[in-house]
Interface confidence: medium
């Protein structure tokens, strides 16, 4: 899977969209999880309604919400009051039984609030190293990964 970068401003909301084939994933619940380390598990943050027919209802876990347009085939995740610690690699997943298919890999980057004059740098992202799979841009406030970037710092 390519990785799509979504950038948001600290303190504001960021909306992440994950398009999918609505026929292929018919009847399946969806989830948003956070990747723990480059080879680690993806830890569930929030999932859609237990009843698939009610997937359009927004579900919250803390400051993260999820809603699913099952007919149009778009999963939408909202990260409210974005903070630097929200930056990192995530996945949109389609659940079937005990299995989970990755719909999209997402790298969330947090930009400093331009009205916040603390000298904290203007961008936070998880790390740099020698290589990472190509990312493509789908949002106006998103970008491709630069050559040499990966979403995790190198392990010692």
């Amino acid at each position: 899977h390519n990785t799509t970068v979504f950038q948001g401003v600290a303190g504001q909301s960021l909306q992440v969209s994950c398009p999918y084939d609505s026929m292929k994933h018919w009847g399946r619940r969806k989830a948003w999880c956070r990747q723990l380390g480059e080879k680690g598990p993806c830890q569930r943050v929030v999932s859609t309604h237990n009843l698939w027919l009610l997937s359009f209802l927004r579900r919250w876990n803390g400051s993260t919400a999820i809603t699913d347009d099952t007919l149009g085939g778009t999963l939408t995740i909202t990260l409210r009051n974005l903070q630097p610690h929200d930056a990192g690699l995530y996945q949109c997943q389609s659940l079937h039984g005990s299995e989970a298919d990755t719909l999209r890999k997402v790298l969330v980057e947090v930009l400093a609030d331009p009205l916040d004059h603390r000298d904290a740098g203007d961008l936070w992202f998880p790390g740099e190293s020698e290589s990472f799979e190509d990312a493509h841009v789908e949002h106006s406030i998103s970008r491709s990964l630069l050559e040499g970037e990966i979403p995790f710092p190198p392990t010692s």
Epitope: M23, K24, G27, R28, N50, W52, H96, G97, E99
Partner: antibody, heavy 123, light 112 residues
């Protein structure tokens, strides 16, 4: 009406590979998972895996992982199942079977089956 | 993998009499979306399997109403209210809640 037509019987030697085809018609080929199920002589049904023709995504049963490859040709609405490193225990009838989709929720049941392809592995 | 266990393995029934086949799964078959993906197939002699019942109790199109399915969680039953000669064959329960999909060993129905 929905039809799944499979290729003819095959006789193979141990260690060889076999490729069975299943041509679909009468429905939106790209939008339904296709399964492969086999049945050894006098035995029950055994699920091998499935393919989604829309994008070629596959799930294989652990038992066949590394030996089975499922592919599709959307231009001819045909799916293929290739099994390598054949042994005598692979002698069986191989079926393709479409997954039924039923609202609300995907039913994941196999509603239409091919006529079966007998693969005999013998030295 | 989920193991499906059918009982009995064979059944001999007089035409017009009822028949019942039980299927038990090693784990709950309730999917994360709330549905239960337990199905019943019939394989008549010399034919490909055919779908009878899907998602526990839904009759597939063209299936006579003498066939009915019930159950929940891990225990399921297929009932034939009045067996007819054309019902002979091997009946399989199957789950598709989790990959890999699995089948019961089959129950052979014969006519007395």
């Amino acid at each position: 009406q929905v039809q799944l037509v499979q290729s003819g019987a095959e006789v193979k030697k141990p260690g060889a590979s076999v490729k069975v085809s299943c041509k679909a018609s009468g429905y939106a080929f790209s939008s339904s998972w296709m399964n492969w199920v086999r049945q050894a002589p006098g035995q029950g049904l055994e699920w091998m895996g499935r393919i989604y023709p829309g994008d070629g995504d596959t799930n294989y049963a652990q038992k066949f992982q590394g030996r089975v490859t499922m592919t599709r040709d959307t231009s001819t609405s045909t799916v293929y199942m290739e099994l390598s490193s054949l042994r005598s225990e692979d002698t069986a009838v191989y079926y393709c079977a479409r997954l039924l989709r039923n609202q609300p929720g995907e039913s994941y049941a196999m509603d239409y089956w091919g006529q079966g392809t007998l693969v005999t592995v013998s030295s | 993998d989920i193991v499906m266990t059918q009982t009995p393995l064979s059944l001999s029934v007089t035409p017009g009499q009822p028949a019942s086949i039980s299927c038990r799964s090693s784990q709950s078959l309730v999917h994360s979306n709330g549905y239960t993906y337990l199905h019943w197939y019939l394989q008549k002699p010399g034919q490909s399997p055919q779908l009878l019942i899907y998602k526990v109790s839904n009759r597939f199109s063209g299936v006579p109403d003498r066939f009915s399915g019930s159950g929940s969680g891990t225990d399921f039953t297929l009932k034939i209210s009045r067996v007819e000669a054309e019902d002979v064959g091997v009946y399989y329960c199957s789950q598709s809640t989790r990959v890999p999909y699995t089948f019961g060993q089959g129950t052979k129905l014969e006519i007395k």
